[in-house]
C-alpha cells in the first residue's frame, strides 16, 4: 500500500477553496447585457427584479415595471413591445430541451397600469414574440402558430398541421434545436412586421428514442422523442412566409428550395430578413460540405416568393464540412444586396469576406493565421467583429472595428488595450446602429461589463465589475493559471495548466486532464472560472491541464478538419502526446495521472483510458458518447459521413468505446450517466457497461435517475461532484 498524501498549502492566512464553495456557487460572477430599445435607451432587470429604463444621453433611469407587478404573476422574464405600449411577462418556466421551454404569458398595458383582459393567451405557450414594429404578437401553442394584431384582439390561427412529436410549426424538433438552429424558435418577422417566415418540421417518419422517466408514480412514464440517429430518416423541412396584414386572404406561401439542394436529403440552416420584401435562406446538403445561400424576393404580382438562380451562393468545403460548428450567417449591408460573411480563405483560415455578386468574386476583408469569429454589427461606416488575432493566442477574443467607409478600410482593435491583464476574452452588445455598445469581458481576471460610445469607443460607465466577488475572493488561495503552447513534430497544441497555490517545480504533483475535444470546440480560453477543477488544484494540490488537440477550433482548417471522418483518433492521440510532454516537465507524478470528461469529453477520456499506453491510473466519463451510430444524425454525419458500407461504416464501428473494452482492465474507470438524457442517450453507457461485463473487466458506475445530459438538479450535482472527488482522491491516495 502507498502512504496516503495530504496536500497542505503552506504558511498563508488565506484559505483554500472547498468543494462546498463550488457546489453552493459562492464564487459565481455577474455579467450585464443591456436590453436595447433604441440607439441610446435600454432596459435592465435589477437584482431585486424591477425592470429599469435607462437613457445613456440624458442619464435618466427609472422603474418602468415594479417587482411587485412581476411578483403578482410570478414573472421571471419580460419583453417590451416595440411601440412601448405593452410588456409581456413570462412565468411558469418549464424547461424542455437545451433551449426550449414552455411558459405562461401575461400582457401588461403600461398606460393603464393593468393586465390586458379578454382573449388571454392559452397556456402553456412554446414560444412568443412581438413583431419588430408595433405590438403584434406571434406565438406557438401545441405546435401551431397564432397571430394577434393587438394584445386584446382574438388570435388568428396561421397553421393547422401541428401535432405533438409529428409536425412542428415555428419551433424546431429535437435535432434541429440541438444541432442546427441552437434556438427554441423557428419563425422570423420581417423588419417592418408585415411578413412572418416560419419553418414546418415533419417528423412523421423519424424513429423514436424512448426512455423511462421514473418520477414518483407506481409506474414509470415513457418519454418518446423523434430523434434521428446517424443514417436514420431525417425531418422533412419546408419554409413558409405569411402576410400578417391579411393572413386570412392569402395563406402561407412556401419558399422554394434551391434545385442543387433539393435533389437529395437536405437541411434548412438559417433565415435572415434582408429588407421588408427580401429574405435570405440558407440550406445544407445532408452530406454537410455544401451550403447554399439563397436570396428571395416577394413578387406582388404572383403573390409568391421568388429565389432566382443568380441569387444563389454556394459555399463548399473540400477538406471537411462547411462552416465551423454551424455555417455562418450573412450580415447584409444597407444596400440589401451585398453582405459580409465568415468562411474559409484559400489558406484554410476563417475570415470575413464581402460578397457583392458571386462568392467567386468575394473580397477578403480580414486575413492572417488567425480567425474571425463573429460579425456583431454592420453599419453605414463600420463593421464590428471579434477575432483571436491579438498576440497570437487562439483562446482570446477581442472586438475590432473596420471602417468600411474609408478606402482602403482601416482596422482598429477596440478592446486589446483596455484592461490588458484582466480582460482578454470579450463579447459585445450593440445598440441598433452601434451608437453605443456594451463590452462584456469574461476574463482571465474578474469579469467586467462596461458601456461605450460607438463613435469614439470611449468608456462611458462600468455596468458591473463584480466587486462583491472580488471582496469574497480576497481571503481565498486561488491556483495559478497558465496558458502556453507545446510543440510535437509539426503540431502546436495550446494548453491551460491550473497549478496549486505555492506550486513548487521541484516537487511531484498528481495530474488531472480535463478534456472535451469535440470538433470545433475550444477548451483553452482566457476566461475566469472558479469551478470543480479550481477546487481540486486549490485544496487537493492536483495539477489540472486542458489541451486543445486536433479537431478543435479557431486555428485553421488543417487543424480543424484533421478529424474529418475519423473521430476518436487524433483527439485522443493529442491528449496522450500532451501528457507525455507534461511528464517531461518534471513536476508530474507519473504514477498519479487521471483524465475526465463529459459528453464528447467522456468519449475521449474513455478512449484515452483504453489506449493501452499505461499513462493513466484512473479516469471518469460522464454521459459519454460510446458510438457515433447512437448519436444525432446532423452531428455525427457532419464529421463522420454516413454509417453505410459504401461510406464510413468501418470507422463508425472501430471508433466505439465498446471495441476497446479489454483495454480497461488496467485502469480504474468510473462511468456516470443520467437515465433521462435526451441528448446522449443512456444507451451509450449501457453499451459500455455491457461490453465491460462481457469482457469481465471491473469498473465503477453511477447513474442519476431522471437526470438529463447536464445532471444539473441541485441534489444530483452535489452527489456527482462529491462522488467524483472521492474517486479521484482515492485514485491519487489523497486522504479525506
Amino acid at each position: 500500500l502507498r502512504p496516503s498524501r495530504v496536500y497542505k498549502p503552506e504558511g498563508n492566512t488565506k484559505r483554500a477553496l472547498t468543494l462546498k464553495d463550488i457546489l453552493n456557487g459562492t464564487f459565481s460572477y455577474k455579467t450585464y447585457f443591456p436590453n436595447w430599445i433604441s440607439e441610446q435607451e435600454y432596459l435592465h432587470q435589477s437584482e431585486d427584479d424591477n425592470i429599469v429604463f435607462y437613457n445613456i444621453e440624458t442619464r435618466e433611469s427609472y422603474i418602468i415595471l415594479s417587482n411587485s407587478t412581476m411578483k403578482s404573476v410570478n414573472a421571471t422574464d419580460y419583453g417590451l413591445s416595440p411601440d412601448r405600449q405593452f410588456v409581456y411577462l413570462e412565468s411558469d418556466y418549464s424547461k424542455l430541451w437545451r433551449y426550449s421551454y414552455t411558459a405562461t404569458y401575461y400582457i401588461y398595458d403600461l398606460q393603464n397600469g393593468e393586465f390586458v383582459r379578454g382573449y388571454e393567451l392559452p397556456r402553456p405557450i412554446q414560444y412568443l414574440c412581438w413583431s419588430p414594429v408595433g405590438s403584434k404578437l406571434a406565438y406557438v401553442y401545441q405546435n401551431n402558430i397564432y397571430l394577434k394584431q393587438r394584445p386584446g384582439d382574438p388570435p388568428f390561427q396561421i397553421t393547422y398541421t401541428g401535432r405533438e412529436n409529428r409536425i412542428f410549426n415555428g419551433i424546431p424538433d429535437w435535432v434541429y434545436e440541438e444541432e442546427m438552429l441552437a434556438t427554441k424558435y423557428a419563425l422570423w418577422w420581417s423588419p417592418d412586421g408585415k411578413f412572418l417566415a416560419y419553418v414546418e418540421f415533419n417528423d412523421s417518419d423519424i424513429p423514436i428514442i424512448a426512455y423511462s422517466y421514473y418520477g414518483d408514480g407506481q409506474y414509470p412514464r415513457t418519454i418518446n422523442i423523434p430523434y434521428p440517429k446517424a443514417g436514420a430518416k431525417n425531418p422533412v423541412v419546408r419554409v413558409f412566409i405569411v402576410d400578417t396584414t391579411y393572413p386570412h386572404h392569402v395563406g402561407p406561401m412556401e419558399v422554394p428550395v434551391p434545385e442543387m439542394i433539393a435533389s437529395s436529403d437536405y437541411y434548412f440552416s438559417w433565415l435572415t430578413w434582408v429588407s421588408s420584401e427580401r429574405v435570405c435562406l440558407q440550406w445544407l446538403k445532408r452530406v454537410q460540405n455544401v451550403s447554399v445561400l439563397s436570396i428571395c424576393d416577394f413578387r406582388e404580382d404572383w403573390h409568391a416568393w421568388e429565389c432566382p438562380k443568380n441569387q444563389e451562393h454556394v459555399e463548399e468545403s473540400r477538406t471537411g464540412w462547411a462552416g465551423g460548428f454551424f455555417v455562418s450567417t450573412p450580415a447584409f449591408s444597407q444596400d440589401a444586396t451585398s453582405y459580409y460573411k465568415i468562411f474559409s480563405d484559400k489558406d484554410g483560415y476563417k475570415h470575413i469576406h464581402y460578397i457583392k455578386d458571386t462568392v467567386e468574386n468575394a473580397i477578403q476583408i480580414t486575413s492572417g493565421k488567425w480567425e474571425a469569429i463573429y460579425i456583431f454589427r454592420v453599419t453605414q461606416d463600420s463593421l464590428f467583429y471579434s477575432s483571436n488575432e491579438f498576440e497570437g493566442y487562439p483562446g482570446r477574443r477581442n472586438i475590432y472595428r473596420i471602417s468600411i467607409g474609408n478606402s482602403p478600410p482601416s482596422k482598429k482593435c477596440v478592446t486589446c488595450h483596455l484592461r490588458k491583464e484582466r480582460c482578454q476574452y470579450y463579447t459585445a452588445s450593440f445598440s441598433y446602429k452601434a451608437k453605443y455598445y456594451a463590452l462584456v469581458c469574461y476574463g482571465p481576471g474578474l469579469p467586467i461589463s462596461t458601456l461605450h460610445d460607438g463613435r469614439t469607443d470611449q468608456e462611458i460607465q462600468v455596468l458591473e465589475e463584480n466587486k462583491e466577488l472580488e471582496n469574497s475572493l480576497r481571503n481565498i488561495q486561488l491556483p495559478k493559471v497558465e496558458i502556453k503552447k507545446l510543440k510535437d513534430g509539426g503540431l502546436t497544441f495550446w494548453y491551460k495548466m491550473i497549478l496549486p497555490p505555492q506550486f513548487d517545480r521541484s516537487k511531484k504533483y498528481p495530474l488531472l486532464i480535463q478534456v472535451y475535444g469535440g470538433p470545433c470546440s475550444q477548451s483553452v480560453k482566457s476566461v475566469f472560472a472558479v469551478n470543480w477543477i479550481t477546487y481540486l488544484a486549490s485544496k487537493e494540490g492536483i495539477v489540472i491541464a486542458l489541451v486543445d488537440g486536433r479537431g478543435t477550433a479557431f486555428q485553421g482548417d488543417k487543424f480543424l478538419h484533421a478529424v474529418y471522418r475519423k473521430l476518436g483518433v487524433y483527439e485522443v492521440e493529442d491528449q496522450l502526446t500532451a501528457v507525455r510532454k507534461f511528464i517531461e516537465m518534471g513536476f508530474i507524478d507519473e504514477e498519479r495521472i487521471a483524465i475526465w470528461g463529459w459528453s464528447y469529453g467522456g468519449y475521449v477520456s474513455s478512449l484515452a483510458l483504453a489506449s493501452g499506453t499505461g499513462l493513466f491510473k484512473c479516469g471518469i466519463a460522464v454521459a459519454p458518447v460510446s458510438s457515433w451510430e447512437y448519436y444525432a444524425s446532423i452531428y455525427s454525419e457532419r464529421f463522420m459521413g454516413l454509417p453505410t458500407k459504401d461510406d464510413n461504416l468501418e470507422h463508425y464501428k472501430n471508433s466505439t468505446v465498446m471495441a476497446r473494452a479489454e483495454y480497461f482492465r488496467n485502469v480504474d474507470y468510473l462511468l456516470i450517466h443520467g437515465t433521462a438524457d435526451d441528448n446522449v442517450h443512456f444507451q451509450n453507457s449501457a453499451q459500455i457497461a455491457k461490453a465491460l461485463v462481457n469482457a469481465q473487466v471491473d469498473f465503477q458506475a453511477m447513474w442519476y435517475s431522471d437526470q438529463n445530459h447536464g445532471i444539473s438538479s441541485g441534489r444530483s450535482q452535489n452527489h456527482l461532484y462529491t462522488h467524483m472527488t472521492h474517486f479521484l482522491k482515492q485514485c491519487f491516495s489523497l486522504s479525506d
Epitope: 433604441s38 440607439e39 441610446q40 435607451e41 437613457n55 440624458t58 412601448r84 397600469g113 451608437k435
Partner: nanobody
Framework: QVQLQESGGGLVQVGGSLRLSCVAS????????MSWVRQAPGKGLEWVAS????????YYADSVRGRFTISRDNAKNTLYLQMNSLKSEDTAVYYC?????????VNQGTQVTVSS
C-alpha cells in the same frame, strides 16, 4: 425647467388635414424619444405615435396608421404630427410627451375638433 408647447390645433372638416407642432425647451430634445398622445372627451389618454431621438424610427397606433405622420427637427427642438384624412373620432386634445414609455405626463395640449 422642462417645457413642451403644443400648437396647430383647430376646427377642421372630416377628410381634412392639420399639422401640429410641439416646441421643446429645458432639456436636450435630440436625446429624447418623443410621442404624441390624445384624450377624447370623457376618455383616458390614448397613445398616437412615437419617434426615436434621431428620427429614423416611428411607431403608430393602428387607428391612425397610414393617415398620421410623426416627424421631428432636432435643430429646431420641434416635434410634428401631420394629420391627414381626419375622422370625427380623431376629435381630442393632443399632447406631446417626452416620457420614453407610458404612463404619459402631459401639459396643456392643443384641441383638435373634426366636424362633419
Amino acid at each position: 425647467q422642462v417645457q413642451l408647447q403644443e400648437s396647430g390645433g383647430g376646427l377642421v372638416q372630416v377628410g381634412g388635414s392639420l399639422r401640429l407642432s410641439c416646441v421643446a425647451s429645458g432639456f436636450t430634445f435630440s436625446s429624447y424619444y418623443m410621442s404624441w398622445v390624445r384624450q377624447a372627451p370623457g376618455k383616458g389618454l390614448e397613445w398616437v405615435a412615437s419617434i426615436y431621438a434621431d428620427g429614423d424610427m416611428t411607431y403608430y397606433a393602428d387607428s391612425v396608421r397610414g393617415r398620421f405622420t410623426i416627424s421631428r427637427d432636432n435643430a429646431k427642438n420641434t416635434l410634428y404630427l401631420q394629420m391627414n384624412s381626419l375622422k370625427s373620432e380623431d376629435t381630442a386634445v393632443y399632447y406631446c410627451a417626452k416620457d420614453p414609455l407610458p404612463p404619459y405626463h402631459v401639459n396643456q395640449g392643443t384641441q383638435v375638433t373634426v366636424s362633419s
